[in-house]
Interface confidence: low
């Protein structure tokens, strides 16, 4: 008699029990976090934690702690019920604890800058370590009122997991307060201080005459010379040098919330806005079969690209994750890991005229800094939740 458990049908360490009463002839008893007849599906189980206004429910990074919501359309709070903050200085003012607000202009429309009392030095005059912040640090959900350098930006929750994006930048210069405020602060215009968020660059943006043309020709496989500038996003990498295989060059894996019905448009928008923001060429990578390297999250391929360590058999044996995460959401939003190629050929000490992060780790710090000061979310088609840089590797030698 054939033992239905002989083929080890249960994934992720599930235990198999042969039973005549089951349609498959066996039952898998799944470990915590997995479900399905063969334990192949991740089960973030948001339970009664419901994400409103299209928000996506994500498992907590800490076992035994609440799931978190990645909110869309500017909504916030643990359940995405907090309405979007007004643009600029409001009302209500985004500056807490009697901070004074001044409006700024930027890529994402009107912004703001807070002038804060010394006792509350966060970008919105938050008080890191304030009452109610204990225990929230590092729980995966950004608590804006607990975000600031003193508390490592809510334990990295508000800065893409990077505890201190300005590490190495002299603290007395307080560049995290001045970052991307629309004014040039020479003391912050260095690699360590993240080039003052490019506030010192001229021209600051792609000229309107070129912008639409460069948008229409972004990463189309042809080098548009007029678009091959930092402020126009280096034509999405179309003009990068031919030497070296782009498949093995540096890349960024981004965990982002997008809406599948408009996925292509959103991927394009994501690549272009990040190219313009970071002043490097960025594009969605393709795999060997010519498919976009975009993977539903959670899922084995997605987590591998994000740098997660796992059982070496996971990839081959895990069923493909086709179910978007967050059955409990009331929208079509879903989590995706998007692998983006990066053209850093114009950055670095050899190109002093092109001031941009010259390695993927610095790109991550720059993105983390933007997230920390609230400058990233308004630009993107959906919340960016994590970034994993890959420095690039040499292609394997041909096996003859």
């Amino acid at each position: 008699e054939i033992d239905p458990c002989h083929s080890q049908p249960c994934f992720h360490g599930g235990t198999c029990e042969a039973t005549a009463g089951s349609p498959l002839g066996f039952i898998c008893h799944c470990p915590k976090g997995f479900e399905g007849p063969t334990c192949s599906h991740r089960a973030p189980s948001c339970g009664f934690h419901h994400c409103h206004h299209g928000g996506l429910c994500l498992p907590s990074p800490k076992p035994g702690f609440p799931p978190r919501c990645a909110c869309l359309s500017g909504y916030g709070g643990p359940d995405c019920l907090t309405p979007p903050a007004p643009k600029g200085c409001g009302p209500p003012s985004p500056c807490l604890y009697n901070g004074s607000c001044s409006e700024t202009t930027g890529l994402g429309g009107p912004g703001f800058r807070c002038s804060c009392p010394h006792s509350s030095p966060g970008p919105r005059c938050q008080k890191p370590g304030a009452k109610g912040c204990e225990g929230r640090s590092g729980d995966g959900a950004c608590d804006a009122g607990c975000s600031g350098p003193g508390g490592n930006w809510d334990g990295g929750d508000c800065s893409l997991g990077v505890p201190d994006p300005w590490k190495g930048c002299p603290s007395h210069s307080r560049c995290w307060l001045l970052f991307r405020d629309g004014q040039c602060h020479p003391q912050c215009d260095s690699e360590e201080c993240l080039f003052d968020g490019y506030d010192c660059e001229t021209p600051p943006a792609c000229t309107p005459a070129y912008d639409q043309y460069c948008h229409d020709h972004f990463h189309n496989g042809h080098c548009e010379k007029g678009c091959n500038t930092a402020e126009c996003g280096w034509d999405g990498g179309d003009c990068r040098p031919e030497d070296g295989d782009p498949e093995w060059g540096p890349s960024l894996a981004l965990l982002v919330v997008l809406s599948p019905p408009a996925l292509d448009q959103q991927l394009f928008a994501l690549a272009r806005v990040l190219s313009l923001t970071l002043r490097v060429g960025l594009w969605v990578r393709k795999d060997r079969d010519g498919r976009d390297m975009v993977y539903p999250y959670p899922g084995a391929r997605a987590e591998e690209k994000l740098g997660g360590t796992r059982d070496p058999t996971y990839q081959e044996r895990a069923a493909p994750q086709t179910q978007p995460l967050g059955k409990e959401t009331d929208s079509l939003s879903a989590g995706f890991v998007v692998v983006m190629g990066v053209d850093l050929s114009r950055c670095g000490p050899d190109h002093p005229a092109s001031r941009c992060p010259w390695d993927p780790g610095l790109l991550l710090r720059f993105l983390a800094a933007m997230a920390a000061v609230g400058a990233l979310e308004p630009l993107l088609p959906g919340p960016l939740l994590a970034v994993h840089p890959h420095a690039g590797t040499a292609p394997p030698a041909n096996q003859l």
Epitope: K32, E35, G36, S45, F48, G64, F65, P66, G135
Partner: antibody
């Protein structure tokens, strides 16, 4: 408005069987895990069975394992509890409840086990 | 299974008093703890989930705290309508388990 309505309780002899139903309305039933919780007269609350949103996973405490089966029909928005080999200690009010933090409960149905 | 041990099993306090009920888990449950109120002859009602989050419509005099193995439900100012039995519950590991209950009465 979320509503959970249990039915199927009644008097049964020891060793007998009973099937409880819970009709759900006012929310997307197929998106939520569901549970049965019981309360013996004058006693505390005890979780009897839990099922995840798609019916793929079920959980039971040792006290009912092998005797009770929880199931659901998402097309009918209905949760079931098939109880077998009933004992005197199974006598209780049986509630169906939504989620792991039971924010919503039915009014309960009484199961009496007596000869 | 994880045991949830509540104390005291019953208490009597005056209106306006601060009342504290504790719940100890036999192993670490993170913050996956809920508290319920059950009035005589009524269905249990969710008060607190994730250890400290008040459920919609629950008066602010009810608060929860704790993580790991030790949890507390506090009623800051006891009211006559708070006479009930209170239960803690863990939902960190299956099967989810309840404490044995704490009966609160007015002196």
């Amino acid at each position: 408005e979320v509503q959970l309505v249990e039915s199927g309780g009644g008097l049964v002899q020891p060793g007998g069987s009973l099937r409880l139903s819970c009709a759900a309305s006012g929310f997307t039933f197929s998106s939520y895990g569901m549970s049965w919780v019981r309360q013996a007269p004058g006693k505390g609350l005890e979780l009897v069975a839990t099922i995840n949103s798609n019916g793929g996973r079920t959980y039971y405490p040792d006290s009912v394992k092998g005797r009770f089966t929880i199931s659901r029909d998402n097309s009918k928005n209905t949760l079931y509890l098939q109880m077998g080999s009933l004992k005197a200690e199974d006598m209780a009010v049986y509630y169906c409840a939504r989620d792991q933090g039971f924010a919503y409960w039915g009014q309960g149905t009484l199961v009496t086990v007596s000869s | 299974d994880i045991q949830m041990t509540q104390s005291p099993s019953s208490l009597s306090a005056s209106v306006g008093d601060r009342v504290t009920i504790t719940c100890k888990a036999s192993q670490d449950v993170g913050t996956a703890v809920a508290w319920y109120q059950q009035k005589p002859g009524k269905v249990p009602k969710l008060l607190i989930y994730w250890a400290s989050t008040r459920h919609t419509g629950v008066p602010s005099r009810f608060s929860g705290s704790g993580s790991g193995t030790d949890f507390t439900l506090t009623i800051s100012s006891l009211q006559p309508e708070d006479v009930a039995t209170y239960y803690c519950q863990q939902y960190s590991s299956y099967p989810w388990t309840f404490g044995q209950g704490t009966k609160v009465e007015i002196k």
